[in-house]
Interface confidence: low
């Protein structure tokens, strides 16, 4: 685990602990496309409320509707899912309830015995036709990384076709994945060339593999399974955040770092710096300066803007998130380019959460 | 394998002062948070307090509040438990415990604390 | 006086199904999840369902766990003589912001 000294900002005031936070697993509201969906945010006291969706602020439009405590989506599509939060601020506290909205179709909350979804996927070859294996539909395998909240039901698909029809097994990490390797095992539905895993757990994350072979050839997908535990745990941020940027001499950049914590995080933006032309201090650690944090004086403390950045601003960026569990971080890179020089966005690296085991 | 091992306890007068250890192995003690749990003899479970994973959080149940102080040393993968001002009513088994996922998932056997005149 | 409410006895004979409550408030059952604890005589406890319905790893699947509002329960089916134990629910109190335990129900395999 990374030591972070703070030797270069002794004036960050410590950390509260927190007031309330929500320990439980968030109820999952669950809805098809096209419905409507209304939800009432369980706070007493809720003068005034807020509303959150994915940490972003949400307000009203012609789909959302903000009613006292009630949010109402109308009309509901896969963009509506994700992690929403009612905030109630009173003159004294702040109280946080979280929930999560899932639009997607029966499947993947759990009830798999009617799906239909997919049968078109099990194509029949002529027989004189001998072809290797080939993805039928690969839209329904744009989506590598699945973050899942813990106890609910996971779907893989690798939809394929080929002649003679091609066969299809699933690894773990890499390796044979077995049915003893979880509790409850999982399910295949090879017609419809699927993994499921129910209620899933922890120990679930991993890279899923699926490999389609026959006598003509082989291919292969995977998937990168992170189950979100919504109970107190240490912070989990959120894959590929923040991004890597680039920019050139006098412009302006933002770095990201998504967070999903249910005890109060506590998020900490810091850089590398030099101290009388050393990176690092006599004991060996590195000088490291806190450039902004969460607290009562800080915006959104998970955006992190720089403007007109000089030269000096290039470097390495590390959004460390803290909770009283524990702390993971991630980091990215900020490239500064001579004015003459178009800028452009580097290729962003996604790296797998830190979760600091 | 995890394992936690609870040291310290022993006969104390009423308004004296223990100190009880709880040596941790078998995982990395600086990311978790660890309880302390008290079982007077033939009653049942009572939490004491809880640290946060670094330190900076501590909570503590009414009964022992200003009385007992939690604390670690993370270098020695070491959890503390100061009590002073000692009551009768404080004999108990007393059991650290891990903190992981909402839920204590493993506890140490015990060290026995008895507060007799 | 425990801040969760438990019976403090139950009792089945083997091969039986038997169930233990827990009942509590708003600020814990209520609004954070429950774990049970096994203690089997002169031994630690130890965690038998976590979030309220999951069993960690060598756990049987004869102990199950629900919720409902602000009540939860435990329940052990096709009942064995080494299930004589008892048993603690648990949670967290978001209003005094520490751990509440049940207090304990004694399990008898007649």
């Known amino acids: 685990r990374p030591s972070f000294s703070l030797v270069e900002d002794t004036t960050l005031e410590p950390e509260e602990p927190p007031t309330k936070y929500q320990i439980s697993q968030p109820e999952v509201y669950v809805a098809a496309p096209g419905e409507s969906l209304e939800v009432r945010c369980l706070l007493k006291d809720a003068a005034v409320i807020s509303w959150t969706k994915d940490g972003v602020h949400l307000g009203p439009n012609n789909r959302t509707v903000l009613i006292g405590e009630y949010l109402q989506i109308k009309g509901a599509t896969p963009r509506d899912s994700g992690l929403y939060a009612c905030t109630a601020s009173r003159t004294v506290d702040s109280e946080t309830w979280y929930f999560m909205v899932n639009v997607t179709d029966a499947i993947s909350s759990g009830d798999d015995e009617d799906d239909t979804d997919g049968a078109e996927d099990f194509v029949s070859e002529n027989s004189n036709n001998k072809r290797a294996p080939y993805w039928t539909n690969t839209e329904k395998m744009e989506k590598r990384l699945h973050a899942v909240p813990a106890a609910n039901t996971v779907k893989f698909r690798c939809p394929a076709g080929g002649n003679p029809m091609p066969t299809m097994r699933w690894l773990k990490n890499g390796k044979e994945f077995k049915q003893e390797h979880r509790i409850g095992g999982y399910k295949v539905r090879n017609q419809h060339w699927s993994l499921i895993m129910e209620s899933v757990v922890p120990s679930d994350k991993g890279n899923y593999t699926c490999v389609v072979e026959n006598e003509y050839g082989s291919i292969n997908h995977t998937y990168h399974l992170d189950v979100v535990e919504r109970s107190p745990h240490r912070p989990i941020l959120q894959a590929g955040l923040p991004a890597n940027a680039s920019t050139v001499v006098g412009g302006d950049v933002e770095f990201v770092c998504k967070v999903y914590s249910d005890a109060q995080p506590h998020i900490q933006w810091i850089k590398h710096v030099e101290k009388n032309g050393s990176k690092y201090g006599p004991d060996g650690l590195p000088y490291l300066k806190v450039l902004k944090h969460s607290g009562i004086n800080s915006s959104n403390a998970e955006v992190l803007a720089l403007f007109n950045v000089t030269e000096a601003d290039a470097g390495e960026y590390i959004c460390k998130v803290s909770n009283y569990i524990g702390q993971a971080n991630q980091s990215a890179w900020l490239t500064v380019l001579p004015k003459q020089q178009a800028p452009g966005r580097e290729k962003e690296i996604t790296a797998s959460p830190d979760y600091l085991e | 394998e995890v394992q936690l091992l609870e040291s310290g306890g022993g006969l104390v007068q009423p308004g004296g002062s223990l100190r009880l250890s709880c040596a941790a192995s078998?995982?990395?003690?600086?990311?978790?948070?660890i309880h302390w749990v008290r079982q007077a003899p033939g009653k049942g479970l009572e939490w004491v307090a809880v640290i946060s994973y670094d330190g900076s959080n501590k909570y503590y149940a009414d009964s022992v509040k200003g009385r007992f102080t939690i604390s670690r040393d993370n270098s020695k993968n070491t959890l503390y438990l100061q009590m002073n001002s000692l009551r009768a009513e404080d004999t108990a088994m007393y059991y650290c415990?891990?903190?992981?996922?909402?839920?204590?998932?493993?506890w140490g056997q015990g060290t026995l604390v008895t507060v007799s005149s | 006086q425990s801040v969760l409410t438990q019976p403090p006895s139950a009792s089945g004979t083997p091969g039986q199904r038997v169930t233990i409550s827990c009942s509590g408030s708003s600020s814990n059952t209520g609004s954070n999840t429950v774990n049970w604890y096994q203690q089997l005589p002169g031994t630690a406890p130890k965690l038998l369902i976590y979030r309220n319905n999951q069993r960690p790893s060598g756990v049987p699947d004869r102990f199950s766990g629900s919720k409902s509002g602000t009540s939860a329960s435990l329940a052990i089916s096709g009942l064995r003589s080494e299930d004589e134990a008892d048993y603690y629910c648990?949670?967290?109190?978001?209003?005094?912001?520490?751990?509440?335990f049940g207090g304990g129900t004694k399990l008898t395999v007649l």
């Open positions: 078998g995982f990395t003690f600086s990311n978790y948070g």
């Open positions: 648990e949670t967290w109190d978001s209003n005094t912001r520490g751990v509440v």
């Open positions: 415990a891990r903190d992981s996922s909402s839920a204590e998932d493993y």
